[in-house]
Amino acid sequence: QSPPGKPEIHKCRSPDKETFTCWWNPGSDGGLPTNYSLTYSKEGEKNTYECPDYKTSGPNSCFFSKQYTSIWKIYIITVNATNEMGSSTSDPLYVDVTYIVEPEPPRNLTLEVKQLKDKKTYLWVKWLPPTITDVKTGWFTMEYEIRLKSEEADEWEIHFTGHQTQFKVFDLYPGQKYLVQTRCKPDHGYWSRWGQEKSIEIPNDFTLKD
């Protein structure tokens, strides 16, 4: 039996700059029941506070609801592990909520096979920003990627689309079924997970319908 190992704050992420969650890796428990507490202060302020919500985001996590989330403030976050034999504290993590945004994936992905005047076929991929994203006010601006592959292929083909919420994919094989996903990233944040997969078959004998 021994004091607990040093916990490590794994990551902090916000879906929308309005709430955020931090997760930690516990380290060894020293063979004893061990309690974990997350404490934080804000840069330039003296007070230290304990995590407001250990439940919402699951085990080894702390959820900061709107009430506890400030932007333009740096949070200094530590996790403390305690058992009968002693305690240990993680290295502090400095968090600016503006820089930890990991949004939900884009929504309303639509796929349509179309044809140019020269009869060249393409796949028109369109989508919308994630629901929470207030793109129009400039609170968020998102960049996007799409990825696609034929059902037979092993590797995805990735296309960066910048701030555009549509993309035309050329040089697809007739008769093949293609899988498509999108993801997004805010100016100062992380890529979302890839969104729901959609599929479409490129017809063998595609003719433009009026």
């Epitope: 793109v135 601006t141 960049e143 990735i158 960066f160 910048g162 701030h163 555009q164 035309k168």
Partner: antibody
């Protein structure tokens, strides 16, 4: 016919700011990205960033991020690039260029260039 | 950031020659490569995008090839108006970067 017409040459002192304009015509302004690229005397091309006029989304080269602002005025189909805290090594020809309507980063039409000279 | 390396940096050739310029990316950029031609005092002109697609109005003596990290621009039969500086540029993801340029001169 697609055209990008840029504002005239500028001479600035170190520490000042410059704002270059780029007026687009011959296409739907909000459908295409506008990129800004610069070229120092006798040097190669350096990408500074881009703006998508449809939603004013921007992507900047980290090298310039703290000093540059790209904006658009959709009512006049004009893009602007402001560079602050000018230094002598910012002396260059600044180009605006239209991004391809599908692929973001290739530039199919270019402005004539605006010469910015930074000198004390 | 993705680095783009062009070779050669300069090249002397004669009218009618076949000329190849190469460009190497520091990581996989799939087919997201563009080629530009620039003449003194003028803005660059797009020749090729997506590694091999000729831009509108570009003569068929220009062609692009390659994917992944290695790319080439070929001029099948040099014309007097082709003497210029050529730049490659990746358009895979921001920041977009250019090669250092290849100056094509008359021998």
């Amino acid at each position: 016919e697609v055209q990008l017409v840029q504002s005239g040459a500028e001479v600035k002192k170190p520490g000042a700011s410059v704002k270059v304009s780029c007026k687009a015509s011959g296409y739907t302004f909000t459908d295409y990205n506008i990129h800004w690229v610069r070229q120092a005397p006798g040097q190669g091309l350096e990408w500074m960033g881009y703006i998508y006029p449809n939603n004013d989304g921007t992507g900047y080269n980290q090298k310039f991020k703290s000093r540059v602002t790209m904006t658009t005025d959709t009512s006049t189909s004009t893009a602007y690039m402001e560079l602050r805290s000018l230094r002598s090594d910012d002396t260059a020809v600044y180009y605006c260029a239209r991004g391809d309507g599908n692929y973001v980063g290739d530039m199919d039409y270019w402005g004539q260039g605006t010469t910015v000279t930074v000198s004390s | 950031d993705i680095q783009m390396t062009q070779s050669p940096s300069s090249l002397s050739a004669s009218v009618g020659d076949r000329v190849t310029i190469t460009c190497r990316a520091s990581e996989n950029i799939y087919s997201y490569l563009a080629w530009y031609q620039q003449k003194p005092g003028k803005p660059p002109k797009l020749l090729v995008y997506n590694a091999k697609t000729l831009a509108e109005g570009v003569p068929s003596r220009f062609s692009g090839s390659g994917s992944g990290t290695d790319f080439t621009l070929t001029i099948s039969s040099l014309q007097p108006e082709d003497f210029a500086t050529y730049y490659c540029q990746h358009h895979y993801a921001t920041p977009f970067t250019f090669g250092q340029g290849t100056k094509l001169e008359i021998k």
